[in-house]
Interface confidence: low
């Protein structure tokens, strides 16, 4: 039975040209995390595999940095980065847990900085 829950940064915003940390946290389960996938809509951004470590998609290697932890740092943000991001936790023996984050990249300096986990 899948008892775990995923806590995410939820809906966050950041300024164009800045950076943001996308973070998910799996709790309430003793399942072993074997892999975490980070995706933007239908594109794979990065994989963190328990045995093989991080793999950043070549399409994003200049703007995506692994961590902190199982999170993902997006750099040099553009307005086109606005959209849904998914953290997909592959666990054993529970199965798959998915979290959703919505990122809005703003042109001006009106980005909100109150979201949990968000870096200034």
């Amino acid at each position: 039975m899948m008892t775990g829950t995923i806590e995410t940064t939820g809906n966050i915003s950041a300024e164009k040209g800045g950076s943001i940390i996308l973070q998910c946290h799996l709790s309430s389960t003793t399942a072993q995390v074997t892999q975490v996938n980070w995706e933007q809509q239908d594109q794979l951004l990065a994989i963190c595999n328990a045995d093989l470590g991080w793999h950043i998609s070549p399409s994003f290697k200049d703007r995506v940095a692994p961590g902190p932890g199982l999170g993902l740092t997006l750099q040099s943000l553009t307005v086109n980065d606005t959209g849904e991001y998914f953290c997909i936790y592959h666990t054993y023996p529970d199965g798959t847990y998915t979290g959703r984050i919505f990122l809005e990249v703003l042109e001006s300096s009106v980005a909100e900085h109150g979201a949990r986990f968000q870096i200034p």
Partner: nanobody
Framework: QVQLQESGGGLVQAGGSLRLSCVAS????????MGWYRQAPGKQRDLVAL???????NYPDSVKGRFTISRDNVKNTVDLQMNSLEPEDTAVYYC??????????????WGQGTQVTVSS
């Protein structure tokens, strides 16, 4: 409904080769990471090979140089070419795919497994 169907398993002598194939079918929006895992009797399911959406591959040391994973994004297939097989490779091999059936619906699907037996 999404299904993964493996084929290609069987009995082979040590030093021989096998090619496993897996096809994903059903209401598929997009497929992210695809992979192969294996499970020997009494042991946990272990990673064998991964291929990401951009074609990058990852292998654990135990199969590196002997196994090759490949995918066809048009046919929704993932293959595993296994060479220089050893008795320790005996296991049930499972196909795995991170499949999106809609913009917000992502989960990992597993095949039913195909038995590979390597005799000495």
């Amino acid at each position: 409904q999404v299904q993964l169907q493996e084929s290609g398993g069987g009995l082979v002598q040590a030093g021989g080769s096998l090619r496993l194939s897996c096809v994903a079918s059903g209401s598929i929006f997009s497929i992210g990471t695809m992979g192969w895992y294996r499970q020997a009797p009494g042991k946990q399911r272990d990673l064998v090979a991964l291929v990401t959406i951009d074609g990058s591959t990852n292998y654990p040391d135990s199969v590196k140089g002997r196994f090759t994973i490949s995918r066809d994004n048009v046919k929704n297939t993932v293959d595993l070419q296994m060479n220089s097989l050893e008795p320790e490779d005996t296991a049930v091999y499972y196909c795995n795919a991170n499949i999106r059936t809609g913009w917000s619906s992502v989960r990992t699907y597993w095949g039913q497994g195909t038995q590979v037996t390597v005799s000495s």
